[in-house]
Interface confidence: low
């Protein structure tokens, strides 16, 4: 008993363990190409059941803590392994031994307090390695990366604990596309630590202080093409000559993000430029300038050494005392050769005229998200300002008058492109003046309701997206591209307005339809985006879309953005999938189809009637109904005649000479109805037949081969047969003048055939001795 109990508990434990392991396996979702997603599944270990078919495995945001040496052994073909934020604190030395094909490894934001070179030894194919956000102080006792000869991207360091960069750290790395080092708590930089990497395309350094900046700068001068400094307080930065020989630095771009500068430290930074003569781009993002712009480059040689800088970008520059800011006259000469300047979202309200005039080479100026108004813009764009300017972006400023803006910019003789989007303009006037070379105008998000001839006819590209336009009727003979999405247009604009239009984007309007004629009327249209409109899926629109498979070549957002708005039956269906209602769209086809079907039905019914004697049934029904409708002639209904005699003309001799003699001259005499004698002249034969049968007590059928062949006899038999069914009486008396084959009697006379089968008929005997008995029987039958 005790043993059985133990066995039971062991089985329960195995089941629980097995079910846990299985559930982990089940919650790993893999696609056909071997990409497996196991993010946020609460795994506490690497799941079992991994296979060589897996190419990518993402186990981020779990609680794995530990990776054992056999956990990943089955993943011989794994190329991507992502273990971000999985609380990993321990990795066995040979945990990655089978991952020779691995190209991407992300171990960021875990709890690895020390790093081991044995992890990376087998990873000869590795191109991307992210070790950032782990609480290590150094990169390990020995070099981590000597075998990673294919490495292109390396991210290391953390915010709090990574404090030392040593010479051995980057041994074996000769060339990197990206190197990111987060060392906000750096306390020691060993000289020449970064010098061993001969080529770094993009180096990002997160340094909180500038203490080691000069040493690092000296080491990377000959290797880095793009240096990005993040979160660095440069307020106390002081230049001192670098301990380097004459060097030709490949550095092309220098970016400061989240840095703090002062007027003085800016001057000091400028001195670094003498070492990077090829620098062409400088960028400041989210920086703070604790100063007034009182820059005073002390060394005259700095001025000429800034010569190759062509692009200066400043975004979200915070100047606490921006209202006291200097006119920058001290740096005018520094910027004479700059071609592109962006100063975005930095509270700019004026570019002094003299400064604008010094920007002789400037071709592109972006002053988006600032405080420019027409009054100050006039000063900025004074005579001789920005003489080479081709593109001006004044998006999201405080401009109000389109007319004034155009007039102010007339001084810019080379301006071809103007972006004044996201300004709230007054209603557009009828006429405006613009720089004569202007080809591109962006008026998106300006609240305009009507477009007028204020817009220049020289335009090749016009963007009026996200406004309140409900029509567009402006002739623009050179327009090649029209962006008019997010407005209220109900139809496509008239094609004759844009004879050379190539591209039109008219998404999110109120366009309900477009047709072959409309699209065909744009002679050069190559690209149309018209999705997310309120399409009425009419017969014409749907048949056009069904008949035009080439739509996908013109409509770049076809088919997913083209949905029916109405009729309700098709609401939400893609135009491509919507099928028009046959009732609504194919009435002619439907009517002709129904007619054809009816004709076929009639033919079918006709054929069936012919085959199953339907006409006979109809005639009988009609005759019967007629008979029913006639008023009963009271005195004569059952007593006019004792019997109606139905016979063939060929048997008239027997009837008239024998039967009539025997029955009408007997005692008591029988009154017989004969067609020759008693039918009403001028009355339809069939009516005579019906009337006679109706007025006779019995109907005597004189059957012979002649009778069966006679058409009128058949009618008489028809109606009598009908009466037999209807009234369920024995009104018919059959007299067989000669033997008839039963087959000769038509199928439809089922009762007659039954009577013949059951021998309830009188047979005319050829033996004269028996003929008297025949007459007695006939008289009895008529009387009954």
């Amino acid at each position: 008993m005790l043993r059985a109990l133990w066995l039971f508990w062991i089985l329960v434990a195995i089941t629980v363990l097995f079910s846990k392991r299985c559930s982990a396996q089940e919650s790993l979702s893999c696609d056909a190409s071997g990409v497996c997603d196991g993010r946020s599944r609460s795994f506490t270990s690497i799941p079992s059941g991994l296979t060589a078919a897996m190419k990518s495995l993402d186990l981020s945001f779990n609680k794995i803590t530990y990776i054992g040496h056999g956990d990943l052994r089955a993943c011989a073909n794994l190329q991507v392994l992502i273990l971000k934020s999985s609380r990993i604190n321990t990795i066995e030395g040979d945990a990655f031994y089978s991952l020779g094909s691995l190209e991407h490894l992300d171990l960021s934001d875990n709890h690895l307090s020390s790093l081991s070179s044995s992890w990376f030894g087998p990873l000869s194919s590795l191109k991307y390695l992210n070790l950032m956000g782990n609480p290590y102080q150094t990169l390990g006792v020995t070099s981590l990366f000597p075998n990673l000869t294919n490495l292109q991207t390396l991210r290391i360091g953390n915010v709090e604990t990574f404090s030392e960069i040593r010479r051995i750290d980057f041994a074996g790395l000769t060339s990197l596309n990206e190197l990111e080092i987060k060392a906000l708590s750096l306390r020691n930089y060993q000289s020449q630590s970064l010098k061993s990497i001969r080529d770094i395309h993009h180096l990002t350094l997160h340094l909180s202080e500038s203490a080691f900046l000069l040493e690092i700068f000296a080491d990377i001068l000959s290797s880095v093409r793009y240096l990005e400094l993040r979160d660095t307080n440069l307020a106390r930065f002081q230049f001192s000559p670098l301990p380097v020989d004459e060097v030709s630095s490949p550095m092309k771009k220098l970016a400061f993000r989240g840095s703090v500068l002062t007027d003085e430290s800016f001057n000091e930074l400028l001195k670094l430029l003498r070492y990077i003569l090829e620098l062409s781009e400088v960028e400041f993002d989210d920086c703070t300038l604790n100063g007034l712009g009182d820059f005073n480059p002390s060394e005259s040689d700095v001025v000429s050494e800034l010569g190759k800088v062509e692009t200066v970008t400043i975004r979200r520059l915070h100047i606490p005392q921006f209202y006291l800011f200097y006119d920058l006259s001290t740096v005018y000469s520094l910027l004479e050769k700059v071609k592109r300047i962006t100063v975005e979202n930095s509270k700019v309200f004026l570019v002094p005229c003299s400064f604008s005039q010094h920007l002789k080479s400037l071709e592109f100026l972006d002053l988006s998200e600032n405080l420019m108004v027409e009054e100050y813009l006039k000063n900025s764009a004074c005579k001789g300002a920005w003489p080479s300017l081709q593109t001006l972006v004044l998006s999201q400023n405080h401009l109000r008058s389109m007319q004034k803006t155009g007039e102010i910019l007339l001084t810019l003789k080379n301006l071809t492109s103007l972006d004044i989007s996201r300004n709230t303009f007054h209603p557009m006037p009828d006429s405006c003046q613009w720089p004569e070379k202007m080809r591109f105008l962006n008026l998106s998000s300006t609240g305009i309701r009507v477009v007028k001839t204020c817009i220049p006819q020289t335009l090749e590209v016009l963007d009026v997206s996200n406004n309140n336009l409900d029509s567009f009727s402006l002739f623009l003979p050179r327009l090649q591209e029209l962006y008019i999405s997010r407005n209220k247009l109900k139809t496509l604009p008239d094609a004759s307005l844009f004879p050379v239009l190539l591209v039109m984007k008219i998404r999110e309007n109120a366009v309900s339809t477009f047709s072959k004629d409309q699209l065909g009327s744009f002679p050069k249209l190559e690209t149309l985006e018209a999705g997310d409109n309120h399409f009425v899926c009419s017969c014409e629109l749907l048949s056009f879309t069904m008949e035009t498979p080439a739509l996908a070549q013109i409509l770049v957002d076809w088919p997913d953005s083209y949905l029916c708005d109405s009729p309700p039956r098709l609401h939400g269906h893609r135009l491509q999938d919507a099928r028009p209602s046959v009732l609504e769209c194919h009435q002619a086809a439907l009517v002709s189809g129904v007619c054809c079907a009816l004709l076929l039905l009639i033919l079918l019914v006709g054929a069936l009637c012919h085959h199953f004697h339907g006409l006979w049934y109809l005639r009988m029904m009609w005759a019967w109904l007629q008979a029913k409708r006639k008023p009963k002639k009271a005195p004569c209904r059952d007593v006019c005649y004792d019997a109606f005699v139905s016979y063939s003309e060929q048997d008239s001799h027997w009837v008239e000479n024998l039967m009539v003699q025997q029955l009408e001259n007997s005692d008591p005499p029988f009154k017989l109805c004969l067609h020759k004698r008693d039918f009403v002249p001028g009355k339809w034969i069939i009516d005579n037949i019906i009337d006679s049968i109706e007025k006779s007590h019995k109907t005597v059928f004189v059957l012979s081969e002649n009778f069966v062949r006679s058409e009128w006899c058949k009618y008489e038999l028809d109606f009598s047969h009908f009466r037999l069914f209807d009234e369920n009486n024995d009104a018919a008396i059959l007299v067989l003048l000669e033997p008839i084959e039963r087959k000769a009697i038509p199928q439809r006379f089922c009762k007659l055939r039954k009577i013949m089968n059951t021998k309830t008929y009188l047979e005319w005997p050829l033996d004269e001795g028996q003929q008297e008995v025949f007459w007695v029987n006939l008289r009895t039958a008529i009387k009954s």
Partner: nanobody, 116 residues
């Protein structure tokens, strides 16, 4: 902003072929589409074709359809114009242009001369 540099122009015999490149740098992530234009002496700038950055779909002017092909290399942020069956009337300065939904950027142009 986006900077564009064209290259690959030069002298070529009629009937020959040439491949132009347009390398984009700067704010390339914002590019919506890129296009090729050309301008012959004394004539207006002419659209040749464009490529959408989102899905690589291309469009061509009738005059070059079938002879010119536009493609791009995503990794290099470069657009190409493969020109075949060149004619003397294809002689022009070839420009590339990018559009980011807000702003147009032009390259400096590269000269293509087709000799008969």
């Amino acid at each position: 902003e986006v900077q564009l540099v064209e290259s690959g122009g030069g002298l070529v015999q009629a009937g020959g072929s040439l491949r132009l490149s347009c390398a984009a740098s700067g704010r390339t992530y914002s590019i919506d589409s890129m296009a090729w234009f050309r301008q012959a002496p004394g004539k207006e700038r002419q659209f040749l074709g464009s490529i959408l950055w989102s899905d690589d779909s291309t469009n061509y002017a009738d005059s070059v359809k079938g002879r010119f092909t536009i493609s791009r290399d995503n990794a290099k942020n470069t657009m190409y114009l493969q020109m075949g069956s060149l004619k003397p009337e294809d002689t022009a300065v070839y420009y590339c242009r990018s559009w980011d939904g807000r702003q147009v950027y032009w390259g400096q142009g590269t000269q293509v001369t087709v000799s008969s």
